[in-house]
């Protein structure tokens, strides 16, 4: 699940990784836009082994993967795309 969250919480990511994670090992991707207490965009990845990692938004692979996910129009994707808007 590719999620976009707008939150008033401060930054959640202490450390960021740029190490590639194949799509098939990803359960969910959460995108936290910058602002509201955090000066940077954050990307949090939930993996199928139940671990969580913050990914460097500048990492080429995550940009490529998000672009692929955005382009796919099907509603039954293993990593479907949806957004949560400001409450």
């Amino acid at each position: 699940v590719l999620e976009v969250y707008y939150t008033s919480l401060r930054c959640r990511c202490v450390q960021e990784s740029s190490v590639f994670i194949p799509r098939r090992f990803i359960d969910r991707i959460q995108i936290l836009p910058r602002g509201n207490g955090c000066p940077r965009k954050e990307i949090i990845v939930w993996k199928k082994n139940k671990s969580i990692v913050c990914v460097d938004p500048q990492a080429e692979w995550i940009q490529r993967m998000m672009e692929v996910l955005r382009k796919r129009s099907s509603s039954t994707l293993p990593v479907p795309v949806f957004k949560r808007k400001i409450p």
């Epitope: 590639f20 194949p22 098939r24 090992f25 199928k48 692979w61 796919r72 099907s74 039954t76 293993p78």
Partner: antibody
Amino acid sequence: EVQLVESGGGLVQPGGSLRLSCAASGFTFSDYYMAWVRQAPGKGLEWVASINYDGGDTYYRDSVKGRFTISRDNAKNSLYLQMNSLRAEDTAVYYCAREEDYDGSYVMDAWGQGTLVTVSS
Amino acid sequence: DIQMTQSPSSLSASVGDRVTITCKASQNINKELTWYQQKPGKAPKRLIYNTNILQTGIPSRFSGSGSGTEFTLTISSLQPEDFATYFCLQQSSLYTFGQGTKLEIK
């Protein structure tokens, strides 16, 4: 030439342990995710486990979670599968496979010849 | 978990025949599907990946097609060395293989 050579298979009693090894050559081992796949006699293929580049991330099929451990030693170009609490249904040929990156999705492109594990009393 | 249903489970054909093997996924896997050939006592050999990309060194009589949940492997003109077992593999969410199709000489 990419080469993967498995070893360590054999006959073991139910509840016993075995450690499989896979020696890799012909490519930069640390640049690839690696996997173990098994095939019971006369049956289909079954993914067992995968490991990322540095061994920090591992993934398992549900039926082996808590019993099997995949690991690697990049300095030795080697992949391992520690199998504990073995059951009769773990009897299979175990293959080591390289996972190649294609457009953000890994696909198994190179396989070893396999090593036979027989769990029987 | 994604299930892969492969059909037929066995198939008899003659040299020169056109053969089609099908794999159906229980959910959308886009184009993340690989086909393998396996001969007795040997490791699987990758034929096609990403649904329709032919592995280097594989003859052009092999082709793949499909998208979403339905995929096919076609051998346009069977050669003696093509008699083997064929497996599909989805790599969209972890890994799941099809049950295999044993291609035998009629």
